[in-house]
Structure formats: structure tokens, C-alpha cells
């Protein structure tokens, strides 16, 4: 375990002073819920003989509407909160004048993240406390002093799961066009172990880094017409909930076993990713279950191996790729990582190399489309928050959407005294308005049966005393006596 190891340092970097372009004028007295970070922002960076102009937009789809944070309180009890009305400072966008460019940055305390121009991936981070106008380092990933990291998923296991791999099955698509299908959504639950917490030092620092990482992963997946939305964050600020071993395969098994036990009382999610400060044995930085997305084994473990969060973001994108059925690029004869990027630079390369990858190869995209043809992949079809991702909330449509606490239909039809039908907010004194664990506007006490067993493999569910809805339907794993 290496929670005290120093972060890797840059070997070579340029110093830049970002300049924020003046945006549209806004009134000085902003309502407090709008926060300090504008919806859109542009910066000019003078780097590598160019002036790069970054046009950024706040990633409004970063957090699901029911996003929760779980940690251990000072008294030792586990606390799950649903932070409300939080502003954030995580942005995505492009570089002016470069058609296939991409950018993913946080602006919370200076600029930190990446921007991609042609075949160059530039990383940026603050050098001092001077905020967004202060001194920043701009550098390329190969100038980080770090060793190459590898994926622990073995080629043998991939072969048995994915079958023969030849280029014949891969139909290259012209240019970088998005797959012509509905956007898919990965509802992601991130667990941060105690070693990582110790390394970062506070819940706030962990939250910041995780949001930064997920913002980057989401940006990498957007080219595949995927969105990655964080629905839950669990920080082991007191102690680990299971043994995090330097052997990544052991840690993954422990994660999946733990997740199966916790699933009924934790947020609904499609995929769980552990970020650990433990140094995995050898050069391995990640390990995943292949083609497990949407199943009880949907998850992976990731070592936070680089000073810049883009490092662990690339690892997470890679391991999530395995969850989505992707193989290592080297294993596929004729696999093409777009011509303008040299070999080994794509996300599903078996080794992360010294330069962080920034795109998926043709064969990764084909594996993904093949996985999406399976009935198993249906969990990716639902937008995590209907109201936000596919249109504004409508009070009175029976769907409890962003900003609503209840929805009992139009005022003339509503017969629910717990819900104010004109505002879709709870009536005065009401704790709840919907759900099998809601009775007469109050949450039922813990232990009350809310879903009986359907058959011998099913498990009965009980109200938890905190939520108006019955926990997710759980069942015994096959082979359980």
C-alpha cells in the first residue's frame, strides 16, 4: 500500500497565463442557486507557439438528479446524503478552429484537465494559488515522470469470452461520425477507498477529483454516443469496507461481492468503479469483468496512478470498455486506431503507455455496437434523469422529475393530500407522497415488508425507515442453496 507516495512530477512543461474572454454581461446580484460558475466560458491559452481558444460549457449531465454521497460521520455511523442545488465547476468543450478537438476541464481553482488538438493531447494544471489567471503548466502526458501502466485483464480470459478476433468483423466508419443510434447512459457509482482518501486528505478533495475524473471519462465516451453520469459517490474516509489487496483480481472479487450485498440499499446504478490509492502489484493499474455491464458483476478497480486525474480517467474509461465488451486493440488483427494517431494511443490498448490515450479504435466501437445488440444492455437505454436529459420537467405528468418532490397529476385530478399538485412539492408536514414505504404522508418504519418473495430465488424487501420507496428488487445468486 502506498498512500504516502509522492505524486509523479512533470519533466517538461510550458508556463501559460490563461485569459478569460469576456462573456455576455450578467446582473451582479445573481440568485444564490445559480452559483459562481457561468454556464459557458472561454479561455485563451498561449502555448506551443499557438494561441489556443477553449470554448467550454458546464457539464450539466455530470450528476444524476438523485445523486448521493455516502461517508462515515464523526460518530462512526454511515451517512448517505443527497446534496441539493450544488453548483459545480466541471466543463467540456472544444478548441476554436480545430474540428475534431475536445476539452474537459475543471475551473474550480485554476484550470485543470485536458484539451486535444489533432493528435496532441495537452494537459493543463495550476502551478500556484493564483486562480484561473495565475501561472499554469501546459504539457503533454509523455512528459509526466511515470511508468507505463497495464490492464490486468488477461488476453486468455478475453479470448474465451469474446471468441475469434479478426478485422473482418469491423466495419470502419467514415471520419469520426457518431453511431446513428440513441444515446446510451452509464449510471455510475464510484467508491473511493481509504488509501485514496488518505492521499487526498479530505472529503472535499476526493469529491473534486472524482467529479474531475468522471467528467473526463464522459468526454471520452461522447464520441461513442455514450454519456457517463455519476449517480453515487462513496468515500471510505474512516476505513475500507472490504480488503483492498495489491492483487487487483482479489480486489475486484471483493468489490463485486460487497456490491451484491449492498445493492438493495444503495443507489440504482449500472456500473461500479473503485478508485484506490493502493499500488497494485507490478505495472497493473486496472482490472475489470468483461461484458458484465448491466449485470451484478458490472464493475472494475482502478489505481490512481498519476498526478493528473486524466490518468485514472483513462484507466477507468479502459476498464469500463471491458465491462462494455471491448477487447484489447492488440488482440484484434487489423484493428485501426485512427490514422492520425500512432499505434497504441487508443483507449483499449493493453498498456496505457507514457501518453494518455484520447479515443476508441474502430474495433472497440464495433465490439460496443455488438454488445448493445444483446438484451443484457437494456440498462443503458434509460436516461438517468428523464427530466434533465430529455426535456424539462412538467409538473402534473405523474413523473417525479428534477426539482419535484412529488407529482400526482393535474390539480383537477390529484387525490394525493401529501402532494401540492400545483407546485409538485410535498404538502406542509408531509415526509413523502409516493412509494410503497410511504403511508399517510410519512415514511414507514424500518423493517416493514414492502415486497414479498415471488419465488424461491427471490428475496423479500423491507422498508429502510428513510426512503419512501421499497429497495430495489433483489434475488439470490444462481447456485445459492
Amino acid at each position: 500500500i502506498a498512500p504516502s507516495r509522492p505524486w509523479a512530477l512533470m519533466e517538461q512543461y510550458e508556463v501559460v497565463l490563461p485569459w478569460r474572454l469576456p462573456g455576455p454581461r450578467v446582473r451582479r446580484a445573481l440568485p444564490s442557486h445559480l452559483g459562481l460558475h457561468p454556464e459557458r466560458v472561454s479561455y485563451v491559452l498561449g502555448a506551443t507557439g499557438h494561441n489556443f481558444t477553449l470554448h467550454l460549457r458546464k457539464n450539466r449531465d455530470l450528476l444524476g438528479s438523485g445523486y448521493t454521497e455516502t461517508y462515515t460521520a464523526a460518530n462512526g455511523s454511515e451517512v448517505t446524503e443527497q446534496p441539493r442545488g450544488q453548483d459545480h465547476c466541471f466543463y467540456q468543450g472544444h478548441v476554436e478552429g480545430y474540428p475534431d478537438s475536445a476539452a474537459s476541464l475543471s475551473t474550480c481553482a485554476g484550470l485543470r484537465g485536458f484539451f486535444q488538438v489533432g493528435s496532441d493531447l495537452h494537459l493543463i494544471e495550476p502551478l500556484d494559488e493564483g486562480g484561473e489567471g495565475g501561472r499554469h503548466a501546459v504539457y503533454q502526458a509523455e512528459h509526466l515522470l511515470q511508468t507505463a501502466g497495464t490492464c490486468g485483464v488477461s488476453d486468455d480470459s478475453l479470448g474465451s469470452l469474446l471468441g475469434p478476433r479478426t478485422a473482418a468483423v469491423f466495419r470502419p466508419r467514415p471520419g469520426d461520425s457518431l453511431p446513428s443510434r440513441e444515446t446510451r447512459y452509464v449510471e455510475l457509482y464510484v467508491v473511493v477507498d481509504n488509501a485514496e482518501f488518505q492521499m487526498l486528505g479530505s472529503e472535499a478533495a476526493v469529491r473534486h477529483r472524482v467529479l474531475e475524473v468522471v467528467n473526463h471519462v464522459d468526454k471520452l465516451y461522447q464520441k461513442l454516443n455514450f454519456r457517463v453520469v455519476l449517480v453515487g459517490l462513496e468515500i471510505w474516509n474512516s476505513q475500507d469496507r472490504f480488503h483492498v489487496s495489491p492483487d487487483p483480481s482479489v480486489t475486484l472479487e471483493n468489490l463485486l461481492t460487497w456490491q451484491a450485498r449492498q445493492r438493495t440499499r444503495r443507489h440504482l446504478h449500472d456500473n461500479v468503479q473503485l478508485i484506490t490509492g493502493v499500488d497494485f502489484t507490478g505495472t497493473t493499474v486496472g482490472f475489470a469483468r468483461v461484458s458484465a455491464m448491466c449485470s451484478h458483476s458490472s464493475g472494475a478497480v482502478n489505481q490512481d496512478h498519476s498526478k493528473n486525474p486524466v490518468g485514472v480517467a483513462c484507466t477507468m474509461a479502459h476498464e469500463m470498455g471491458h465491462n462494455l465488451g471491448m477487447d484489447h486493440d492488440e488482440n484484434v488483427q487489423g484493428c485501426r486506431c485512427q490514422e492520425r494517431f500512432e499505434a497504441g494511443r487508443c483507449i483499449m490498448a493493453g498498456s496505457i503507455g507514457s501518453s494518455f490515450p484520447r479515443m476508441f479504435s474502430d474495433c472497440s466501437q464495433a465490439y460496443l455496437e455488438s454488445f448493445l445488440e444483446r438484451p443484457q444492455s437494456v440498462c443503458l437505454a434509460n436516461a438517468p434523469d428523464l427530466s434533465h436529459l430529455v426535456g424539462g420537467p412538467v409538473c402534473g405528468n405523474l413523473f417525479v422529475e428534477r426539482g419535484e418532490q412529488c407529482d400526482c397529476g393535474p390539480p383537477e385530478d390529484c387525490r394525493n393530500r401529501c402532494c401540492n399538485s400545483t407546485t409538485c412539492q410535498l404538502a406542509e408536514g408531509a415526509q413523502c407522497a409516493h412509494g410503497t414505504c410511504c403511508q399517510e404522508c410519512k415514511v414507514k418504519p424500518a423493517g416493514e415488508l414492502c415486497r414479498p418473495k415471488k419465488d424461491m430465488c427471490d428475496l423479500e424487501e423491507f422498508c429502510d425507515g428513510r426512503h419512501p420507496e421499497c429497495p430495489e428488487d433483489a434475488f439470490q445468486e444462481n447456485g445459492t442453496p
Epitope: A381, D385, L386, L398, F399, V400, R402, C414
Partner: nanobody
Framework: EVQLVESGGGLAQAGGSLRLSCAAS????????VGWWRQAPGTQREWVAS??????????YVDSVKGRFTISKDNTKNTVYLQMNSLKPEDTAVYYCC?????????CGQGTQVTVSS
């Protein structure tokens, strides 16, 4: 995981009718509500109509379809229908069936295309 499958889309003349079906893989009574959304090219998906699936049936509609569209359900077939009459060219869109069983969480189908020609 719940699966919703839409069918019944197609080409219709202005003033004509279509009936969309949404078949659920499980019992629709396990949901709080089932609804239809639609999305025309280049626009955000908009809510069209919903139906409560247990207790007294409530059927709200977006103003633009009131009096023309009717949402209904058949609990025995685990299916929700959208009867669309007096169709207009502006009703052209992909129609999605969505279901909700808990706050801030919905399942949606893959959609069915409806094209209304003038």
C-alpha cells in the same frame, strides 16, 4: 431490468389516425406511471401524455394533443396505448414510451417513428 417495446408507428396522412402500443416485459402495475414522450429532429424530447397504472386512472396530456390523443392501458396485457387521431404534420417525431417506478428514475424504450404527411 425492465424492457419497454414500442410499436404501431408509421406513415399517416394529415387528419388520419395511428395507434401506438407499449409492451412492458413485466407487470405495468409495478410502475407509478407510464407515459409517452416524442422527439422531432433537432428538438428536445417533449412529454406527450401519461397514465397512472394503479388506483384511480389519471391521464394528463400536453396542451397541443388534448382532444386528439388518448392514452389507455390494458393491465392484463401489460400494455399502454396511445391512440392518435386528427394527426398533424407537427406530430411527426420518434415516440418513446417511458415508465417510472421511483422518483427521478425512468425506463424508456427505443422509440417508434411517426411521420405525418400533408
Amino acid at each position: 431490468e425492465v424492457q419497454l417495446v414500442e410499436s404501431g408507428g408509421g406513415l399517416a396522412q394529415a387528419g388520419g389516425s395511428l395507434r401506438l402500443s407499449c409492451a412492458a416485459s413485466g407487470s405495468i402495475t409495478s410502475f407509478n406511471a407510464v407515459g409517452w414522450w416524442r422527439q422531432a429532429p433537432g428538438t428536445q424530447r417533449e412529454w406527450v401524455a401519461s397514465i397512472s397504472t394503479s388506483g384511480s386512472t389519471i391521464t394528463p396530456y400536453v396542451d397541443s394533443v388534448k382532444g386528439r390523443f388518448t392514452i389507455s392501458k390494458d393491465n392484463t396485457k401489460n400494455t399502454v396505448y396511445l391512440q392518435m387521431n386528427s394527426l398533424k404534420p407537427e406530430d411527426t417525431a420518434v415516440y418513446y414510451c417511458c415508465a417510472t417506478e421511483r422518483m427521478h428514475h425512468s425506463y424508456c424504450g427505443q422509440g417508434t417513428q411517426v411521420t405525418v404527411s400533408s
